[in-house]
């Protein structure tokens, strides 16, 4: 059962796992949610009746029954983890805490003009978990405007105290706001010899990398595969750090793999969601329950629905036993990973999918693409929407992309002459325009947010957000696309597609079926040569064949240029402008979305 409200002046008795310090009950709830075992918590607020050393303590708790006895206590605030909830969860915390000093290891001290600048510095520093900033009103003259970057083993403060004229806050890495590079490569036959901060068991290097990504201190990792010669170290995942933030020594060893934390691109890759099955593999751990199940998929469902289950092993039925049902072993451990991994016993193992909601919905795998042809099939581009105007008569105006449950990203030039959002309708999950009838459900538009530097498509800033009046329930036919990571600026995308209902040639009409075309990206230098009369800026991206023939056209505007990278689709461009359509040596010009990630997040995350 999902309980989101906080219980004031209430303390849960017993069930303690560990105590951390958090600046608020709300953040305590987030920490509990991300902890592998925490189901409930009790936070102690500042209060004259409470011992100051207990202020800001966040006690993480677990219970076999998923609840604990309640006791009245002034200044205590208790609640439940969001693990029990189905809604999307984020660790992003933009709050600034006034007159609080969050203690940790102060490893960097510098002057900053504002708390915001200090927070940005923390976000762009690989080691920084949180910061404290002494304002210009701080009593001690030599400490005024000092920005202290801090880290701890847990990522949360070691203590929090009241201190006048300082402010504290957390790194915004988990808000997708870091400019740090995102190195996705996994290096085969490589061991990083730097400090081990922790070790866990993992079935493969990808799971190891995801564990590293959500571990507060892990910057890179080494994984020893099941073929590693030392039996005691097989399937061992070493979580590592170094003072420089990079591995100092790479040792070449067969059957080992190493890689980096994907912290700075975690909003566009799955981090918590280990959805694969591992055949002929047994996960060992504390046994929660043994249930009969028809298949390993059914076993995974049972694990996902049992809030305390973290991973499972399924042993298929022996021929005619138990109506063809196998045994499903639901398991847990102190850190969410198996305590040991064994091979060759015939089991099929995997992880709960309960934590998938901690990842961005946009990372969910969608239906395989239909290769060849120009007409799309249902569910192929579930982020694509058709934007209609109802004035003077209803018609398709532009394309757009779902990027959040209340947000559509499109082009600014679509709104030339649009006086009010009231005349707009957004249709999602549509393949054919002919499906749209009087009674077809749509999303009304609450607000049109056009970039304030936009003048005309050709001069850039051709980007706009639509805030919907109601939220989109994600399904197979309507779900978001990931924004590119700022750390991914140097990625070379090779699998890019433009989609829309636009014209198929310059003098044509809106198409009934959603069209798709695979189009290669063109460098900005090459694109500039093709448009000598225009300035192709770094905020634009171009795509097209030298010989022409495939391109976006009128009516595709505002729609996505979608590129697949590491199995995840990213919204790399927004269809903006071009000379004619599909002309030789005239690539299409798109708004370069990565350059607007900050703007998008600022507008969509505004309180």
């Amino acid at each position: 059962e999902c309980v989101t409200q906080l219980l004031k002046d209430t303390c849960f008795e017993g069930g303690d796992i560990t105590t951390v310090f958090t600046p608020s009950a709300k953040y305590c709830q987030v920490v509990c949610t991300y902890h592998p075992r925490c189901l409930l918590f009790t936070f102690t607020a500042e209060s004259p009746s409470e011992d100051p050393t207990r202020w800001f303590t966040c006690v993480l708790k677990d219970s076999v029954t998923e609840t604990l006895p309640r006791v009245n206590r002034t200044a205590a605030i208790s609640g439940y983890s969001f693990k029990q909830c189905s809604h999307q969860i984020s660790a992003c915390n933009k709050d600034i805490y006034v007159d609080l000093d969050m203690k940790g290891i102060n490893y960097n001290s510098s002057v900053a003009k504002s708390a915001q600048e200090c927070q940005e510095r923390c976000t762009d520093d690989v080691h920084c978990h949180f910061f404290t900033y002494a304002t210009r009103q701080f009593p001690s003259l030599e400490h005024r405007n000092i920005c202290l970057l801090k880290h701890t083993q847990t990522g949360t403060p070691t203590r929090i105290t009241k201190l006048d004229k300082v402010v504290s806050g957390f790194s915004l890495k988990s808000c997708a706001l870091s400019n740090l590079a995102c190195i996705r490569d996994i290096f085969p036959n490589t061991v990083f010899a730097d400090s081990n901060i922790d070790s866990v068991m993992a079935p493969d290097a990808f799971v190891c990398g995801r564990i590293c990504t959500h571990h507060p201190g892990c910057l890179f990792f080494t994984f020893f595969s099941q073929e590693w010669p030392k039996e005691s170290q097989r399937n061992l995942c070493l979580l590592k750090t170094s003072e420089s933030g990079l591995p100092s020594t790479r040792i070449k060893k067969s059957k080992a793999l190493s890689g980096f934390s994907l912290q700075s691109c975690r909003h566009s890759i799955p981090v918590f969601c280990h959805s694969s099955f591992y055949h002929d593999t047994d996960f060992l751990g504390e046994e929660l329950d043994i249930v009969a199940a028809k298949s390993h998929e059914a076993c995974q469902k049972l694990c996902t629905n049992a809030v305390r289950c973290q991973f499972f092993t399924y042993t298929p039925a022996q021929a005619s036993c138990n109506e063809g049902k196998g045994k499903c072993y639901l398991k847990l451990s102190s850190n969410g990973s198996p305590t040991k991994i064994l091979h060759g016993r015939g089991g099929i193992s995997g992880y709960t999918l309960r934590l998938c909601k901690m990842d961005n919905e946009c990372t969910t795998k969608i239906k395989p693409r239909i290769v060849g042809g120009t007409a799309s099939v249902r569910g192929e581009w579930p982020w694509q929407v058709t934007l209609h105007t109802t004035s003077p008569t209803q018609r398709h105006l532009c394309g757009g992309s779902i990027i959040g449950n209340q947000w559509i990203l499109t082009a600014a030039h679509c709104f030339y002459g649009v006086e009010s959002p009231k005349i707009l309708r957004v249709y999602s999950g549509i393949l054919n325009q002919s499906e749209i009838k009087e009674d077809t459900s749509f999303f009304g538009v609450q607000e049109i947010i056009i970039h304030d530097q936009y003048k005309m498509a050709e001069s850039g800033y051709d980007i706009a957000l639509l805030k919907l009046e109601t939220t989109v329930n994600y399904t197979d036919s309507q779900r978001p696309i990931c924004l590119p990571s700022k750390g991914d600026r140097n990625v070379i995308y090779t699998d890019c597609w433009v989609t829309g209902w636009g014209y198929r040639k310059l003098r044509d009409k809106i198409q009934n079926t959603l069209q798709k075309a695979k189009i290669p990206l063109v460098t900005n230098e090459e694109c500039q040569k093709r448009y000598r009369g225009h300035k192709i800026t770094h905020k634009m991206i171009c795509a097209g064949y030298r010989e022409g023939g495939k391109d976006a056209c009128k009516g595709d505007s505002g729609g996505p240029l979608s590129c697949k990278h590491n199995e995840v689709w990213h919204l790399v461009g927004i269809t903006s402008w071009g000379e004619g359509c599909a002309q030789r040596e005239r690539p299409g010009v798109y708004t370069n979305v990565v350059e607007y990630v900050d703007w998008i997040l600022e507008k969509t995350q505004a309180v």
């Epitope: 010669p229 030392k230 040792i251 070449k252 060893k253």
Partner: nanobody, 124 residues
Amino acid sequence: QVQLQESGGDSVQAGGSLRLSCIASGFTFDDSDMGWYRQAPGHQCEFVSHITNDGTTYYADSVKGRFTISRDNAKNTVYLQMNSLKPEDAAVYYCAADAWGGGRSTCVNPIGYWGQGTQVTVSS
């Protein structure tokens, strides 16, 4: 049971040399990768050098050209020859087998096998 015993640590003048030895027992030495790590007061554990079971050697940038790692499988021993010592080389030096990195606060950690450490002091 597994044992790693370091020796050879001493006080030396800057520019001087030392040779550290580490005798191993209780495991198959020939199959194991061996390494040296060090920790100075108030500093994190630092990788120094590594020699794989096939004899390939690796060094931290700070010791390249001055330190040499070697192994004698017949004697179950790994050596670290340290020349042109600098004051910043002063630390407790640990020998490790199949360790792949020190711990966060101390070198000794549950991965692999570790010795007790030997003190190297370098005065200027």
